[in-house]
């Protein structure tokens, strides 16, 4: 039960996180015009990964896309790449984790397969979250560097008395959305990895061997296994001891071609 809850919660947290990463990537407010200690402008500038916008005092907002690829700063390209990689990995992770959920039954998928898929999706979520956090942090670092550079030359002289005011940019809402979303995806991934440990069937130190007497159809199991009759189709071997509370369905093991000699 705890494993299912952990897995389900991990999935939900990751889903919210990835939705947040997608939202942050699409948002225009990665950097916003710094209004503190600046001349009061009748326009408000803000920029995203894909376009820059200007909101005029009348409320009219105009956005222009970055139609060049080669002309953009390498750092911006890197941030774009990190965010896209994060989204792609997260999306694949979500797809994998849907099939890995305990509450969803797909044919006769073994617990070991579900455990592997849970671990895979968990790792994908962790990497996705790290990509988003890294992307947002790189952009934030770029902003901080540019902020202090523009503060140093707040007013650049242009021939005598004429001055041009440099627009300073500060952290936009998308950065905080990205950080939180990346963190959630990371936490969700960790939860999936924890759930994977609980899903994986525990191996015993020795293989269970069945002996068939010529006259009776009785299987003898050494160690922690109860002997069961082999009549009918009931060939399941029930484990008596498992070190942890599990339902009967969770602990069933199906006979393989090596079980009987």
């Amino acid at each position: 039960m705890a494993v299912t809850a952990c897995q389900g919660l991990g999935f939900v947290v990751s889903l919210i996180g990835i939705a947040g990463i997608i939202a942050a990537t699409c948002m225009d407010q990665w950097s916003t015009q710094d209004l503190y200690n600046n001349p009061v402008t009748a326009v408000f500038n803000y920029q995203g990964l894909w376009r820059s916008c200007v909101r005029e005092s009348s409320g009219f907002t105009e956005c222009r896309g970055y139609f060049t690829l080669l002309g953009l700063p390498a750092m911006l390209q890197a941030v774009r790449a990190l965010m896209i990689v994060g989204i792609v990995l997260g999306a694949i992770g979500l797809l994998v984790s849907i099939f890995a959920l305990k509450c969803i039954r797909i044919g006769s998928m073994e617990d070991s397969a579900k455990a592997n898929m849970t671990l895979t999706s968990g790792i994908m979520f962790i990497v996705s979250g790290l990509c988003a956090i890294a992307g947002v942090s790189v952009f934030a670092n770029m902003l901080v560097t540019n902020f202090w550079m523009s503060t140093a030359n707040m007013y650049t002289g242009m021939g005598g008395m004429v001055q041009t005011v440099q627009t300073r940019y500060t952290f936009g809402a998308a950065l905080f959305v990205g950080w939180v979303a990346g963190g959630l995806t990371l936490i969700g991934g960790v939860m999936m990895c924890i759930a994977c440990r609980g899903l994986a069937p525990e191996e015993t130190n020795y293989k269970a061997v069945s002996y068939h007497a010529s006259g009776h159809s009785v299987a003898y199991k050494p160690g922690g296994f109860k002997a069961s009759t082999g009549f009918g189709s009931n060939t399941k071997n029930k484990k008596i001891y498992d070190g942890g509370a599990r339902t009967e369905d969770e602990v069933q093991s199906y006979p393989s071609k090596h079980d009987y000699v």
Partner: antibody, heavy 120, light 113 residues
Framework: EVQLVESGGGLVQPGGSLRLSCAAS????????MHWVRQAPGKGLEWVAY????????YYVDKLKGRFTVSRDNAKNSLYLQMNSLRAEDTAVYYC?????????????WGQGTLVTVSS | DIVMTQSPDSLAVSLGERATINCKSS????????????LAWYQQKPGQPPKLLIY???TRESGVPDRFIGSGSGTDFTLTISSLQAEDVAVYFC?????????FGGGTKVEIK
């Protein structure tokens, strides 16, 4: 047709108060920011104040801050300018003007103005 | 505050001739965010309120004749009346639309020679 009609001007003694009104019609008043601009007789234009469509933010020219207060009533399609502690140098024609949409913050429609004379 | 300096103070031009008015701002009116200039030109005829002619330094307001041409960028702007007509006799003002307080130039009076 967009129309802006100012009223409330007149002769007032120094130190007195006056409240100017601007009645707007022909457009959705609540969607537009509004300005007050004044012009002293025979002189140039001087911007006084701006109030956004939702009454915030509001901007004033520094020298009039504290004495002049701009407000609006979107339900009545009206703009107001409360002028206190009036001085002789406040004598001017006061215009209300609309902050145009998609015209780079320019003032696209102006009223005919109302004359305020501050004299003893 | 941004200081807007207009020149000349007055201008006498023959009908059909070109009239040129200059406007200089103390700070650049070019907004880096959209690379647009926030400068407007107004025409004021005697006894009338100002009328918007040009916004964004070069875009004509609807209904304004195409003989009115706005140009310039940053700190230096020009209003050109390519062929002066009798109805163009007025005072012309430039205005900073980027920084509060929004400031106007002193005005240029255009007359017929």
């Amino acid at each position: 047709e967009v129309q802006l009609v100012e009223s409330g001007g007149g002769l007032v003694q120094p130190g007195g108060s006056l409240r100017l009104s601007c009645a707007a019609s022909g457009f959705t008043f609540s969607s537009f920011g509004m300005h007050w601009v004044r012009q002293a007789p025979g002189k140039g234009l001087e911007w006084v104040a701006y109030i956004s469509s939702g009454s915030s933010p509001i901007y004033y020219v520094d020298k009039l801050k504290g004495r002049f207060t701009v407000s609006r009533d979107n339900a009545k399609n009206s703009l107001y300018l409360q002028m206190n502690s009036l001085r002789a140098e406040d004598t001017a024609v006061y215009y209300c003007a609309r902050a145009g949409y998609a015209v780079r913050n320019a003032l696209d429609y102006w009223g005919q103005g109302t004359l305020v004379t501050v004299s003893s | 505050d941004i200081v807007m300096t207009q020149s000349p103070d007055s201008l006498a031009v023959s009908l059909g001739e070109r009239a040129t008015i200059n406007c200089k701002s103390s700070q650049s009116l070019l907004n880096v965010g959209n690379q647009k200039n926030y400068l407007a030109w107004y025409q004021q005829k005697p006894g009338q309120p100002p009328k918007l002619l040009i916004y964004g330094a070069s875009t004509r307001e609807s209904g304004v004749p195409d003989r009115f041409i706005g140009s310039g960028s940053g700190t230096d702007f020009t209003l050109t009346i390519s062929s002066l007509q009798a109805e163009d006799v007025a005072v012309y003002f430039c205005q900073n639309d980027l920084f509060y307080p929004l400031t106007f130039g002193g005005g240029t009076k255009v007359e017929i020679k």
